[in-house]
């Protein structure tokens, strides 16, 4: 589809005569009829197969034809066609005299013809005008012509339809040959495929508009080259989507088991030393002068019970002072004025006189010590438990509670790996550098999840007078370790003073 355009430029008829030689009265009021048809070697009358057009009266005798494309499109003359331009044509241009206002062929006498020209040849589609001049005996016509494609038609013969668009079906303009030219940011045969952000990962990323980078599930970041850890992951990372690779100090499927409580929480106060002892478990070793689970309590000078033989301690600004019971003296009431006659030995101790009755010595039964057998034996003072094991007093004996990865009476043996499925009751086994660790299901505890969770007998704080409470794991009962000066299963009785 296109348009044959004919631009009339100048017509010369100096004598103002018709083709017959007869002059026009008063002058030749001239208009043109144009016929465009298929190529003929000899142009003959017949249908104007490519179209025809007539002009109004353009002038009298000789005149120049001005451009009038804005005023109704009369010059250049437009001969549209809706077929593929064949590249050849025949053109007939007739100049006629109009005696009156009616320019219809049937209203004109046949001798009103002024001149007739006919040309034929090849013509390629293009913007350039071809200039031509045809001269007869009495007239001369100067004109130019061209063939251009209609809007949205392109190519050598105006046969390629191309309509620019910028919507879901394409984003392009049209090149002169009718090929699509994608708008910036689009590609593909019909320019429907956006060009993603530069560097957007080919597999992990995609885009729905130019310069975008949207990530497929499991990927994140500007270029979709960072993975997303598993939904349940707590303290882990990934190298592929949905992984959970634990950070240092964390364990478990979702990296939610704290294997390094000391580092993560710094629970020990006042410069104490922290030791990890399993999942969310730790032990604080206090500096002198501090006590408590987290070494949060500051000891007074009297907290070490320095006064012997039932002496009472009084804190002073510059230290402490012991008030000795009758029969004792010295800085710590360590010297006795008593003899065996005064029954100074407690807890069933037997008295032996020394220095001809001037002093005495107590022989204590098992589990008791001190110059008057007033102290319960602490069998853990020698730190017998190896590998960070916790020592527990158990009446006349002691036992070691081992850290994960160790076993034996004194935690002296290193447990091997998890190959033997050592965790009971569905416990999960973890191989650690320090040995293995069992993560127990609810209701079970112990190094191998072998113990049904027992009650904490010390939870009710049954021991009096700042005594230390221990749970006897074999009987689920408590044992109180009394401070100096107190006795009884709950340390509820003060030590009786010997008779003076």
């Amino acid at each position: 589809s296109g348009v044959f355009q004919l631009q009339l430029q100048e017509f010369v008829n100096e004598r103002g005569v018709l083709a017959s030689g007869r002059p026009c009265e008063p002058g030749c009021r001239t208009f043109f009829r144009v016929c465009l048809k298929h190529f003929q070697a000899v142009v003959s009358p017949g249908p104007c197969t490519f179209g025809s057009v007539s002009t109004p009266v353009l002038g009298t005798n000789s005149f120049a034809v001005r451009d009038d494309s804005s005023g109704g499109g009369r010059n250049p003359l437009q001969l549209p066609f809706n077929f593929t331009w064949p590249g050849t044509f025949s053109l007939i241009i007739e100049a006629w005299h109009a005696p009156g206002d009616d320019l219809r062929p049937e209203a004109l006498p046949p001798d009103a013809l002024i001149s007739k020209i006919a040309i034929q040849g090849s013509l390629a589609v293009g913007q350039n005008w071809l200039l031509d001049e045809q001269t007869s005996t009495l007239t001369r016509l100067r004109y130019s012509y061209r063939v251009i494609c209609s809007d949205n038609y392109y190519g050598d013969n105006c046969s390629r339809l191309c309509k620019k668009r910028n919507d879901h079906f394409g984003h392009y303009v049209c090149q002169p040959d009718g090929n699509l030219s994608c708008l910036p940011g689009w590609t593909g045969e019909y320019c429907q495929q956006p060009i993603c952000l530069s560097g957007c990962h080919e597999q992990n990323g995609y885009c729905s508009k130019p310069a975008e980078c949207l990530c497929r599930p499991g990927w994140q970041g500007r270029l979709c080259n960072e993975c997303i850890p598993h939904n349940g992951c707590r303290h882990g990372t990934c190298s592929t989507p949905w992984q959970c690779t634990c950070d240092e100090g964390w364990g478990g499927l979702f990296c939610d088991q704290d294997l390094n409580y000391c580092t993560h929480h710094s629970p020990c106060k006042n410069g104490a030393t922290c030791s990890n002892s399993g999942q969310r478990s730790y032990t604080c070793t206090c500096r002198p002068g501090y006590t408590g689970v987290d070494c949060e309590l500051e000891l007074s000078e009297c907290d070490s019970n320095p006064c012997r033989n039932g002496g009472s301690c009084k804190d002073q600004e510059d230290g402490y002072h012991c008030l000795c019971p009758p029969g004792y003296y010295g800085l710590h009431c360590e010297h006795s004025t008593l003899s065996c006659a005064d029954s100074p030995c407690f807890n069933g101790g037997s008295c032996r006189e020394r220095n001809q009755g001037a002093s005495y010595a107590c022989e204590c039964p098992p589990n008791f010590t001190g110059s008057n057998c007033e102290k319960k034996v602490d069998r853990c003072t020698s730190n017998p438990c190896a590998n960070g094991g916790q020592c527990l007093n158990r009446g006349p004996s002691r036992m070691c509670r081992c850290r994960p990865g160790f076993t034996g009476t004194y935690c002296e043996r290193h447990v091997s790996d998890c190959a033997r499925n050592p965790c009971a009751h569905g416990g999960t086994c973890h191989d650690l550098e320090s040995g293995l660790m069992c993560t127990c299901p609810a209701g079970f505890s112990g190094r191998r999840c072998e113990v049904r969770t027992s009650i904490d007998a010390c939870a009710s704080s049954p021991c009096f007078n700042r005594a230390t409470c221990y749970t006897d794991l074999s009987t689920d009962t408590f044992v109180c370790n009394c401070p100096y000066g107190f006795v009884g299963s709950r340390c509820e009785f003060p030590v009786g003073l010997p008779p003076s």
Epitope: R216, G218, R222, G232
Partner: antibody
Framework: EVQLVESGGGLVQPGGSLRLSCAAS????????MAWVRQAPGKGLEWVAT????????NYRDSVKGRFTISRDNAKSSLYLQMNSLRAEDTAVYYC???????????WGQGTLVTVSS | DIQMTQSPSSLSASVGDRVTITCRAS??????LAWYQQKPGKAPKLLIY???NLADGVPSRFSGSGSGTDFTLTISSLQPEDFATYYC?????????FGQGTKLEIK
């Protein structure tokens, strides 16, 4: 235990601004992408914005683009939503969540109410 | 944007009942679908992800199935604490979108 605690909601006039904050704990914040999801009173859930773990790429729903800005401070384990040019239709409970636009929202905060009204 | 349509919008059931909620996507979302539970005045809680994977701590009476465009959440034996509103969500296509919700009420 994973905890996400939002703050900063309140009553604001149309055209006004508000900054929401979300304090995260119980997980290694810097490893995970984060999001804001909102719920208008009596309505359903609507994704608002996400940010990748490395803080290099935010995404927004079309209706808040150019008005809202999501950001994070990995050192403080905190997520933020700066809301400008607020409209009545932005009225909602805003939830801080751990997740991305292409993954489930695994953990949620308790929400903070934003009311835009004159 | 992908439209997510849940049915029914509301549902009455009794403790011990087996309950099914469906979710339909306007186009293929493969298995990239999650289910959430929300109780009044509370935040949503992830129940199921990737169509059929139970989130941590979610009881086994909850299960999910489906693929492509049609998905189902099933509660095998309803418990008193299960009465809530349930939402599906797709995360296959940008932007992520939620269903309108299904309110599960006690009969």
């Amino acid at each position: 235990e994973v905890q996400l605690v939002e703050s900063g909601g309140g009553l604001v006039q149309p055209g006004g601004s508000l900054r929401l904050s979300c304090a995260a704990s119980g997980f290694t914040f810097r490893h995970f992408p984060m999001a804001w999801v909102r719920q208008a009173p009596g309505k359903g859930l609507e994704w608002v914005a996400t940010i990748s773990s490395s803080d290099d790429w935010p995404n927004y729903r079309d209706s808040v683009k150019g008005r809202f800005t999501i950001s994070r401070d990995n050192a403080k384990s905190s997520l933020y939503l700066q809301m400008n040019s607020l409209r009545a239709e932005d009225t909602a409970v805003y939830y801080c969540s751990r997740g991305y636009y292409n993954s489930p929202f695994a953990y949620w905060g308790q929400g903070t109410l934003v009311t835009v009204s004159s | 944007d992908i439209q997510m349509t849940q049915s029914p919008s509301s549902l009455s059931a009794s403790v011990g009942d087996r309950v099914t909620i469906t979710c339909r996507a306007s186009e293929d979302i493969y298995s990239n679908l999650a289910w959430y539970q929300q109780k009044p005045g509370k935040a949503p809680k992830l129940l199921i992800y990737d169509t059929n994977n139970l989130a941590d701590g979610v009881p086994s009476r909850f299960s999910g199935s489906g693929s492509g465009t049609d998905f189902t959440l099933t509660i095998s034996s309803l418990q008193p604490e299960d009465f809530a509103t349930y939402y599906c969500q797709q995360y296959n296509n940008y932007p992520p979108t939620f269903g309108q919700g299904t309110k599960l009420e006690i009969k």
